[in-house]
């Protein structure tokens, strides 16, 4: 009696169980009562990443430099190419199909987390006692200068965008 289900890594065809092709290979012909499944390795820029009965291999992903992409990991016959973004850019999606420039943190904000190839810059507002006077994708908020440690006094209060201005203590006396 012909089988209705096959074992793992097999498939049912013409009332019989044939072996699937291993990752990195495509199906050329199904098995018969007398012959094994015929498989062929994928070509140079192709891959198949599962046990399969595909008659065509998939094309490796192209990391288009015009979209800011570069190869992070070269594809093999069993794996797709992995793209990432050029320095200073990050992916717009998990699939990393295109890139955008890293966000800069405006004056008054500092970098909480530096961007990676897959995540944007995370900024945070500079709190009282700290400032950032630049637009940057790397600069954190800096503490206001401690005038006292220089035997000076605060002549002008700091803001989230400006440092304090120190001056001599005796200016008002």
């Amino acid at each position: 009696e012909p089988p209705t289900a096959c074992r793992e890594k097999q498939y049912l065809i013409n009332s019989q169980c044939c072996s699937l092709c291993q990752p990195g290979q495509k199906l050329v012909s199904d098995c018969t009562e007398f012959t094994e499944t015929e498989c062929l390795p994928c070509g140079e820029s192709e891959f198949l990443d599962t046990w399969n009965r595909e008659t065509h291999c998939h094309q490796h992903k192209y990391c288009d430099p015009n979209l800011g992409l570069r190869v992070q990991q070269k594809g093999t016959s069993e794996t797709d190419t992995i793209c990432t973004c050029e320095e200073g850019w990050h992916c717009t999606s998990e699939a990393c199909e295109s890139c955008v420039l890293h966000r800069s943190c405006s004056p008054g904000f500092g970098v909480k987390q530096i961007a990676t190839g897959v995540s944007d810059t995370i900024c945070e507002p500079c709190p009282v006692g700290f400032f950032s006077n630049v637009s940057s994708a790397f600069e954190k908020c800096h503490p206001w200068t401690s005038c006292e440690t220089k035997d000076l006094v605060v002549q002008q209060a700091g803001t989230n965008k400006t440092d304090v201005v120190c001056g001599p203590q005796d200016r008002l006396r």
């Epitope: 709190p127 009282v128 954190k140 206001w144 006292e148 006094v153 605060v154 803001t159």
Partner: antibody, heavy 118, light 113 residues
Framework: QVQLQQPGAELVKPGASVKLSCKAS????????INWMRQRPGQGLEWIGN????????TYNEKFKSKAALTVDTSSSTAYMQLSSLTSDDSAVYFC???????????WGAGTTVTVSS | DIVMSQSPSSLAVSVGEKVTLSCKSS????????????LAWYQQKPGQSPNLLIF???TRESGVPDRFTGSGSGTDFTLTISSVKAEDLAVYYC?????????FGSGTKLEIK
């Protein structure tokens, strides 16, 4: 010990000005920011602004910029807040308080009750 | 301006009970640069000026009884009184000092049953 002394009460007429005082003792006056707060009857606290006695550098809450003027007299270790063009809305208790660094308030005055009434 | 919201506005508890007061801010008060939350708690007893209890969200001011504990991070903070005493009758305020103007919550009035 560290203290901030404020007069208990001030009665002023509408449209007039009043100068509130806050006398510091028990610490080096010029090294700590002095902050001023307002508390209307039965209400919460509002920060008016602060002043650094070492240089008279100030930071104001925009809401109070045209109402309050902060000054200090380092020779008497006293901070002042002048309130102008008073209306009944300005009737409140006004507190002075010392900042640790630029931040929280570790020492408070007892407060001055300002009553604006004709 | 950062808005501070406190809840409940008032509550009545018996002596010995545990009390939890809540304070929420409209933006995060946590700063990665010093790994601190820019939040303080004050106690104001009737007819008195406020008194500092907790700063940096969880550091107890010297002289404050250890039944007072501050916790939380980011936008959600809590002041816990582990076993209320009659002398804890007061209004409790949270305050942010992350950015100018400094702002206070509207307070929680603690009453003793």
């Amino acid at each position: 010990q560290v203290q901030l002394q404020q007069p208990g009460a001030e009665l002023v007429k509408p449209g007039a000005s009043v100068k509130l005082s806050c006398k510091a003792s028990g610490y080096t006056f010029i090294n700590y920011w002095i902050n001023w707060m307002r508390q209307r009857p039965g209400q919460g606290l509002e920060w008016i602004g602060n002043i650094y006695p070492g240089s008279s550098s100030t930071t104001y809450n925009e809401k109070f910029k045209s109402k309050a003027a902060l000054t200090v007299d380092t020779s008497s270790s006293t901070a002042y807040m002048q309130l102008s063009s008073l209306t009944s809305d300005d009737s409140a208790v006004y507190f002075c308080a010392r900042s640790v660094g630029y931040w929280y308030f570790d020492v408070w005055g007892a407060g001055t009750t300002v009553t604006v009434s004709s | 301006d950062i808005v501070m919201s406190q809840s409940p506005s008032s509550l009545a508890v018996s002596v010995g009970e545990k009390v939890t007061l809540s304070c929420k801010s409209s933006q995060s008060l946590f700063f990665s640069g010093n790994q601190k939350n820019f939040l303080a708690w004050y106690q104001q007893k009737p007819g008195q000026s406020p008194n500092l209890l907790i700063f940096w969200a969880s550091t107890r001011e010297s002289g404050v009884p250890d039944r007072f504990t501050g916790s939380g991070s980011g936008t959600d903070f809590t002041l816990t009184i582990s076993s209320v005493k009659a002398e804890d009758l007061a209004v409790y305020y949270c305050q942010q000092y992350y950015s100018y103007p400094f702002t206070f919550g509207s307070g929680t009035k603690l009453e003793i049953k």
